[in-house]
Amino acid sequence: VPRWRQQWSGPGTTKRFPETVLARCVKYTEIHPEMRHVDCQSVWDAFKGAFISKHPCNITEEDYQPLMKLGTQTVPCNKILLWSRIKDLAHQFTQVQRDMFTLEDTLLGYLADDLTWCGEFNTSKINYQSCPDWRKDCSNNPVSVFWKTVSRRFAEAACDVVHVMLNGSRSKIFDKNSTFGSVEVHNLQPEKVQTLEAWVIHGGREDSRDLCQDPTIKELESIISKRNIQFSCKNIYRPDKFLQCVKNPEDSSCTSEI
């Protein structure tokens, strides 16, 4: 008799998930020699242990603690770049500005970036058919809990001036329901963080509006100010030119507004 399997609303585990996580771990240690002490097999075992044989709607931050411990990493706390709904540009930026870090530039973020995973209660199988959707099924699923856990820790580690890249093309430039709005903003430590500086990235070539005056940015400013952290905001009118100027700051065209 075929065993009944829960059908979730979200896509199933990414194909080659175990191989991808293990390969990414080894690649990460290859390109970050300071992380060569990490035992990638143990990392995979801890990752697997967080969700295998567990109900995929009943995952807790506690389940990920062994993985968090193995992936402990020190990044310069004053060089943190958060982002919301504009991941690609944030990553292009840290590729050029090598001393700044997004969450995906850390081992744990790099391991899980763009992947989906879940298991099934009481079986050691990985579910490649479907996984819970955050909205339609449950919020305490393996992927959501993972990102909530690592995002919280990343924000808690930040100090001095923290930067956040926001997508000015979206109807909600700051979205309280995003990981940035629901987790990271509330876990910045006022005793360590002096300022949150938002970079609002414009989408349209001819868009010269001051998006720092957007109501959702004002809402972000209010939340941050209430937490005794200063807030500042900059418009990035030309993201392509912005990246080019990060690469070549001495370029004569880089003195004007970008």
């Epitope: 080659r16 191989e19 991808t20 390969a23 990414r24 080894v26 690649k27 290859e30 390109i31 020699p33 060569r36 990553h91 590729q95």
Partner: antibody, heavy 120, light 107 residues
């Protein structure tokens, strides 16, 4: 079986650019960092840089920073190394190489090499 | 950058001889060292990784030792196919660097 096959020999003029390709087969291209190493005639090996084929992230030796660009085409499982503003000292054999994950970070697999000759 | 210094730069030996090549790093590289063999017109071949581990398919007459800054490649009994150039390489830190090579010639 695992193979790295490079493009053919090139003869280039001083000041021009060269783009060497390295086609990977027999393994998942995105699972391994790809490195580029060169060797001038009668000289030692010299590491130039790496690319993470999954994301396209790169890092270069300071010496080549301003002149080298390493890229990849995931759909073709191919890495590329482009060197610009060529000078006679760039005449060398250029290799792509990768580790085996089981052999520390030594380069267990190498392409056959591409000879680039720069003439004035 | 970490400097890798090999000695000797060339050595003449006969089949059956025991040969030792040394490699010194300008700073501590722990055991993050590889040895390669290269024959004319060919790509290098990995012999030893992590200073003392033998790569797959490499004959057991090759061995590596050392850690920190001083390393040795030993060929216990030279075979005709061993006449080649040998390079050490550190992968402790970027940029990865190679020694200048040791040419092993027939006496």
């Amino acid at each position: 079986q695992m193979q790295l096959v490079q493009s053919g020999a090139e003869v280039k003029k001083t000041g021009s650019s060269v783009k060497v390709s390295c086609k990977a087969s027999g393994y998942t291209f995105t699972d391994y960092i790809m490195h580029w190493v060169r060797q001038a005639p009668g000289q030692a090996l010299e590491w130039m840089g790496w690319i993470d084929p999954e994301y396209g992230r790169t890092d270069y030796a300071q010496k080549f920073q301003d002149r080298v660009t390493i890229t990849r085409d995931r759909s073709m499982s191919t890495a590329y190394m482009e060197l610009s503003s060529l000078r006679s000292e760039d005449t060398a054999m250029y290799y792509c190489a990768r580790s085996a994950h089981t052999t520390g970070f030594g380069f267990a697999y190498w392409g056959q090499g591409t000879l680039v000759t720069v003439s004035s | 950058d970490i400097q890798m210094t090999q000695s000797p730069s060339s050595v003449s030996a006969s089949v059956g001889d025991r040969v030792t090549i040394t490699c010194r790093a300008s700073e501590d590289i722990y055991s993050n060292l590889a040895w390669y063999q290269q024959k004319p017109g060919k790509a290098p071949k990995l012999l030893i990784y992590d200073a003392n581990s033998l790569a797959d398919g490499v004959p057991s007459r090759f061995s590596g030792s050392g850690s920190g800054t001083d390393f040795t490649l030993t060929i216990s009994s030279l075979q005709p196919e061993d006449f080649a150039t040998y390079y050490c390489q550190q992968y402790n830190n970027y940029p990865y660097t190679f020694g200048q090579g040791t040419k092993l010639e027939i006496k």
